[in-house]
Amino acid sequence: SAPGEDEECGRVRDFVAKLANNTHQHVFDDLRGSVSLSWVGDSTGVILVLTTFHVPLVIMTFGQSKLYRSEDYGKNFKDITDLINNTFIRTEFGMAIGPENSGKVVLTAEVSGGSRGGRIFRSSDFAKNFVQTDLPFHPLTQMMYSPQNSDYLLALSTENGLWVSKNFGGKWEEIHKAVCLAKWGSDNTIFFTTYANGSCKADLGALELWRTSDLGKSFKTIGVKIYSFGLGGRFLFASVMADKDTTRRIHVSTDQGDTWSMAQLPSVGQEQFYSILAANDDMVFMHVDEPGDTGFGTIFTSDDRGIVYSKSLDRHLYTTTGGETDFTNVTSLRGVYITSVLSEDNSIQTMITFDQGGRWTHLRKPENSECDATAKNKNECSLHIHASYSISQKLNVPMAPLSEPNAVGIVIAHGSVGDAISVMVPDVYISDDGGYSWTKMLEGPHYYTILDSGGIIVAIEHSSRPINVIKFSTDEGQCWQTYTFTRDPIYFTGLASEPGARSMNISIWGFTESFLTSQWVSYTIDFKDILERNCEEKDYTIWLAHSTDPEDYEDGCILGYKEQFLRLRKSSVCQNGRDYVVTKQPSICLCSLEDFLCDFGYYRPENDSKCVEQPELKGHDLEFCLYGREEHLTTNGYRKIPGDKCQGGVNPVREVKDLKKKCTSNFLSPEKQNSKSN
């Protein structure tokens, strides 16, 4: 039977009355244009909603905005447009919300053509009050907060100036001209690229990378011949033009650009690109585009220095620079990532890794599903997940895969079951074990969200017709109840719940459409009365993550340790609560070959745990460049996976010798780097 329709499904008692008492409608008395919504702070209940619309006049477009504020998770909204002097706010800059619980908000206003600079509205009290500030420049980008100090802001101007404020946008200072890209690093450091000649575009590949650690008092040039740069985890990356041709290579620094090493990655040509897919303090997933317009490349995983890379996955789907990739970090289980590969026959298949890129496999076929028309063998096929690429191709996929760190093991995604992704209308699948096993959860495309750390899953059918029904499940998607939240259906535009999945409130956004009127409306439903009681010890059960063979002593070992979690029983209908903390018990494992990646010059054949030499490097000395010195690598093909905590067991030999030879990577060597002060 279809999910949620068998006899085992126990109904939640009197849920209609309970939800009806906790359903709050708000009709916005202004009119439908565009709407953007931002949460201010964590667990504050404060939501800001900005509605903007353009009025087409004969010569120009006149804009109007309204700003609304809720402090009860969206149940009620107050029009606070007068706090921003009824000014038109530029939606392309969005609402710049400060980090953590700073309560800071910056809105960028539209100003008339002849003005000297832009205008911002600043709040540092969760949008209770705003201060208008006229800027000495016209902003090109949204204000960026320093992650360490929310009083420090940076912005680029339309004239490519880098502007910094040390008092939350009250006073601004231009610290550098001719800036292309600027980013905050750690410890209030700013990294930025500059051009010398014409423009950012003209000087691409001849840019300089600069650093300031004191908000513009002094500077250090930390790189030349730069194409672009990026930050990921504790790594600073720069793609650098080669001396002799138009190729470029990745260089990496772990000391804020003081010293650089050339990453052992293939160089790329003009039409190719590098992309940091994911990064943490241990390692990096790097995509390297294939030559030609193939739409795919190779994923490499780094060592703990970001220098030596192992091939992780071939034919990785990634369309173009800034294009689409399905690469997804499954945040509900350590070490799990999902992505798509482009097969030789141009079909797209989903792959999953449970060990941070060490090995990739297909997703197991859901037990309650049949193989579709793409399958050659009707009994053997796998689940294929729709993500960013499918959405970009306008397939009937309203949402990307969803997982939350505090909803352990849960992954929800649209998918199809066959030999490859299908263009047919997808269904929604759920995994409760981090992607090892899957079940069809809902028939057809849906919007979905996780509430109360997984205690409730909410879904709304994706339809072109107006809707008035929401579905919810209290047992991780096994059984579903439907609730009619309004008599008059609305054209649905989105689900909004507080980031972090700890809330029990969900807001359904849409608009009502009549011949004469089109208005935004939101319905906020609080599920607190559905989960009547707080969860107790008896409501939780012990679950071993990554368990595939309970008989095996090493069962559950991933990246050198196993973790047991306390997880809510599916049958328990209770509140995890806002203060819920995931309870886990780690234990160290013995080292096996699975705890090692293939070293530079080695690769792992499919379905084999042993690393073998790359044929093209057989018999060659393995030498690479490190901090401007040539190193010689003695290895039998393995290196410990970054972040792997295993002890004892297998211990392959690995030794790096300094060859005492200079090697340069056409990058500034440390001694050539210059500093200057303002």
Epitope: L31, F515, T517, S518
Partner: antibody, heavy 124, light 106 residues
């Protein structure tokens, strides 16, 4: 400048149908609603219904429900009004008009541009 | 449907007179009301929208006021070109017109 040009006069027999067209030029057709209004000889204005071309949905006055069909073809920027089961009391001048809406995109709230009118005579 | 009652149905006035036409809605329509002028054999012409906003190109002697259920169209100084029939129209739900007021020469 937006203009609405309607099809020519029609003489119809009772029980038959009439289809009047309204072609828009010089503006964004899909952004506005199109209303159909009729006026019997010596009588007042009567709203029949309307359509939002960009939305594809039509709305009808209760009196005409089931007898009138309003459609729009975005590719030709033309709206149509078809009235069936004609009776002698349907003899009137039929107007199309651009109808501003209370939404974020539009500023006009009245019928600011009208067609020249199409005379429909129902007679046996 | 919302009913619109216009009064008077006929009004005799002279050039230079101040003329007031009233429109009453059967329920509150906020400010969603428009006024039109129609001359024989011609299509109606929008004068006022949203109860009091003057349509561009319309002389300033025309003004509208009111909200909720009571609305007024005022011609401050009647001109020869103003002799016509005037209609109010609500735009809150589906559209309905008032019965019209004919302004004729006294």
């Amino acid at each position: 400048q937006v203009q609405l040009v309607q099809s020519g006069a029609e003489v119809k027999k009772p029980g038959s149908s009439v289809k009047v067209s309204c072609k828009a030029s010089g503006g964004t057709f899909r952004s506005y609603a199109i209303s159909w209004v009729r006026q019997a000889p010596g009588q007042g204005l009567e709203w029949m219904g309307g359509i939002i071309p960009g939305f594809g949905t039509a709305w009808y006055a209760q009196k005409f429900q089931g007898r009138v069909t309003i459609t729009a073809d975005e590719s030709t920027s033309t709206a149509y009004m078809e009235l069936s089961s004609l009776r002698s009391e349907d003899t009137a001048v039929y107007y199309c008009a651009r109808q501003g809406r209370k939404t974020g995109y539009y500023y006009y709230y009245g019928m600011d541009v009208w067609g020249q009118g199409t005379t429909v005579t129902v007679s046996s | 449907d919302i009913q619109m009652t216009q009064s008077p149905s006929t009004l005799s006035a002279s050039v230079g007179d101040r003329v007031t036409i009233t429109c009453r809605a059967s329920q509150s329509i906020s400010s969603w009301l428009a006024w039109y002028q129609q001359k024989p054999g011609k299509a109606p012409k929008l004068l006022i929208y949203k109860a009091s906003s003057l349509e561009s190109g319309v002389p300033s002697r025309f003004s509208g006021s009111g909200s909720g259920t009571e609305f007024t169209l005022t011609i401050s100084s009647l001109q020869p070109d103003d002799f016509a029939t005037y209609y109010c129209q609500q735009a809150d739900g589906h559209i309905t017109f008032g019965g019209g007021t004919k302004v004729e020469i006294k």
